[in-house]
């Protein structure tokens, strides 16, 4: 018979032969042969593999570093990685939660809609037309553009969501 060019699900092709993949939680020790099945071994303590695989090494569980404010939310198994979260009152910097911040800042062009609490992080909102923020802040709202008219001045440079308008003197008509 012709050697296979593709294999079924949960199999892999090696040496013109379809071998079974190792199940989640196990790593590959040796490929199958004409006479033997794929040999797999369970991952060790603090290791995991979360897919059907042909990996020869298991992945290390994530370490929730207390020096970064992290703690274990869910302990890893042979099939799943450890899930970290932040100490109470702190917030993850990303979905992967690799470090913690007290709260995040709103970038220039954004203002603070709601200051962080122990439960929720800072909520930012874009500065609408007529308002700006030129700083990164965890408490400052968007500021309204300066009104040149009330100062008897004219707009010399338009404002943006990150910059205030620039006012200047009105052109005096010559006699």
């Amino acid at each position: 018979p012709e050697p296979p060019t593709a294999c079924r699900e949960k199999q892999y092709l090696i040496n013109s032969q379809c071998c079974s993949l190792c199940q989640p939680g196990q790593k590959l020790v040796s490929d199958c042969t004409e006479f033997t099945e794929t040999e797999c071994l369970p991952c060790g303590e603090s290791e995991f593999l979360d897919t059907w695989n042909r990996e020869t090494h298991c992945h290390q569980h994530k370490y929730c570093d207390p020096n970064l404010g992290l703690r274990v939310q869910q302990k890893g198994t042979s099939e799943t990685d450890t899930i970290c979260t932040c100490e109470e009152g702190w917030h993850c910097t990303s979905e992967a939660c690799e470090s913690c911040v007290l709260h995040r800042s709103c970038s220039p062009g954004f203002g603070v809609k709601q200051i962080a609490t122990g439960v929720s992080d800072t909520i930012c909102e874009p500065c609408p037309v007529g308002f700006f923020s030129n700083v990164s802040s965890a408490f400052e709202k968007c500021h309204p553009w300066t009104s040149c008219e009330t100062k008897d001045l004219v707009v010399q440079q338009a404002g943006t969501n990150k910059t205030d308008v620039v006012c200047g003197p009105q052109d005096r008509l010559r006699a």
């Epitope: 020096n67 970064l68 404010g69 932040c86 100490e87 702190w90 470090s99 913690c100 911040v101 007290l102 709260h103 995040r104 800042s105 700083v135 990164s136 802040s137 965890a138 408490f139 400052e140």
Partner: nanobody, 116 residues
Framework: EVQLLESGGGLVQPGGSLRLSCAAS???????EMWWVRQAPGKGLERVS?????????YYADSVKGRFTISRDDSKNTLYLQMNSLRAEDTAVYHC?????????WGQGTLVTVSS
């Protein structure tokens, strides 16, 4: 290495005053937004007060408004919190924090105890 060292805490009677300091080193202090955050025994973190990098804008939690004043002296790389009319509920460890507010910038804090 960024370091924030809080001082000025102590035992004070209700109605008394204290001035906390936060000495900053390892970074250019001027221009950084700074916060005072406190943690009462067995309670969560409470954001007390903040000051903008320029010193022109400030924020106060409702619980301290009219009693506490935040200020900064960029020439001394120091943040201050003047606390007047202290109450028992102000008892906490007070920490200062700098942007980007990472956990590894978090100092030991200074303990304020308000009791008669």
């Amino acid at each position: 290495e960024v370091q924030l060292l809080e001082s000025g805490g102590g035992l004070v009677q209700p109605g008394g005053s204290l001035r906390l300091s936060c000495a900053a080193s390892g970074f250019t202090f001027a221009g950084y937004e700074m916060w005072w955050v406190r943690q009462a025994p067995g309670k969560g973190l409470e954001r007390v007060s903040a000051i903008s990098g320029s010193g022109g804008s400030t924020y106060y939690a409702d619980s301290v408004k009219g009693r506490f004043t935040i200020s900064r002296d960029d020439s001394k790389n120091t943040l201050y919190l003047q606390m007047n009319s202290l109450r028992a509920e102000d008892t906490a460890v007070y920490h200062c924090a700098k942007e980007p507010y990472s956990y590894d910038y978090w100092g030991q804090g200074t303990l304020v105890t308000v009791s008669s």
